[in-house]
Amino acid sequence: TCEIVTLDRDSSQPRIEERSQTARCACRKGQIAGTTRARPACVDARIIKTKQWCDMLPCLEGEGCDLLINRSGWTCTQPGGRIKTTTVS
């Protein structure tokens, strides 16, 4: 499970709004860090192991997911045709 935590820096000066969002994710046994619906998530470790990236549903709803060659990552294709590529190191 993940929750988005908003960190407010320098709250003593309300004019300066420097905010950053981080995810705090507590994964269950058999899960590790991944991406679901373009957000940090805990996913089945076997998805990562087998590099079946699209099985973790990394793209936004309505987008199409495709594996890159050699399973080095995935692409998310928007309905309009724009493609976002994510590579895994």
């Epitope: 705090r24 507590a26 994964c27 058999g30 590790i32 860090a33 805990c42 470790a45 192991k49």
Partner: antibody, heavy 129, light 104 residues
Framework: AVTLDESGGGLQTPGGALSLVCKAS????????MFWVRQTPGKGLEYVAE????????NYGSAVKGRATISRDNGQSTVRLQLNNLRAEDTGTYFC??????????????????????WGHGTEVIVSS | ALTQPSSVSANPGETVKITCSGG???YGWFQQKSPGSALVTVI????ERPSDIPSRFSGALSGSTNTLTITGVQADDEAVYFC???????????FGAGTTLTVL
């Protein structure tokens, strides 16, 4: 190189308590789940306890549940096992082990016994009166 | 509990296969030359091999059974091999009783 050094073993008395410490080096300690595994005389390996990379989750084997406490100090790169109400059957060699998966920042991750990639040399514990 | 054979034997140069079944998640294989002595991981996460382990060691997962293969076994490979994984409920780690490899 990844190194895990256990200490704290030795002769213990039944009903007493022991505290084992594992000092880690050569890797980003706070990113890895850690284990204690023991080998008792004439037996194989036995899962004792584990702790998540950030220390928020702990789990224990049935033989020590209720008697053991595992904890970690990510600043000092140490993991500790406290075992109370010692019994003769707790005699054995206690190993510290690392799970290979490197958990990224913002995540709390369990290790996996099948993903142990590094072991300490072990520390011997003898429970006897 | 995990199921693995209690012993196997082979001549130098032969191929040895040791199976382990009954667990969940991923499997690892751990070598021990004598009881209480240091443990060495030869395979982790089903088929990953540490960089200092010879390439003759390999692992493969099929269903819920993992097989450790030693291709061209050597005298130095004589040891007890323990498999490890999570129990079927995924609540705790579990190890096999160990397989003694004898190189004839």
């Amino acid at each position: 190189a990844v190194t895990l050094d256990e200490s704290g073993g030795g002769l213990q008395t039944p009903g007493g308590a022991l505290s084992l410490v594992c000092k880690a080096s050569g890797f980003t300690f706070s990113s890895h789940g850690m284990f204690w595994v023991r080998q008792t005389p004439g037996k194989g390996l036995e899962y004792v306890a584990e702790i998540t990379n950030d220390g928020s989750g702990t789990n224990y084997g049935s033989a020590v549940k209720g008697r053991a406490t595992i904890s970690r100090d990510n600043g000092q790169s140490t993991v500790r096992l406290q075992l109370n109400n010692l019994r003769a059957e707790d005699t054995g060699t206690y190993f510290c082990a690392r799970s290979t998966y490197e958990c990224p920042g913002g995540f709390s991750c369990w290790g996996d016994t099948g993903q142990i990639d590094a072991w300490g040399h072990g520390t011997e514990v003898i429970v006897s009166s | 509990a995990l199921t693995q054979p209690s012993s196997v034997s082979a001549n130098p140069g032969e191929t040895v296969k040791i199976t382990c079944s009954g667990g969940s998640y991923s499997y690892g294989w751990f070598q021990q030359k004598s009881p209480g002595s240091a443990l060495v991981t030869v395979i982790y996460w089903d088929d990953e091999r540490p960089s200092d382990i010879p390439s003759r060691f390999s692992g493969a997962l099929s269903g819920s059974t993992n097989t450790l293969t030693i291709t061209g076994v050597q005298a130095d490979d004589e040891a007890v091999y323990f498999c490890g994984t999570e129990d079927i409920s995924g609540t705790a780690g579990v190890f096999g009783a160990g397989t003694t490899l004898t190189v004839l």
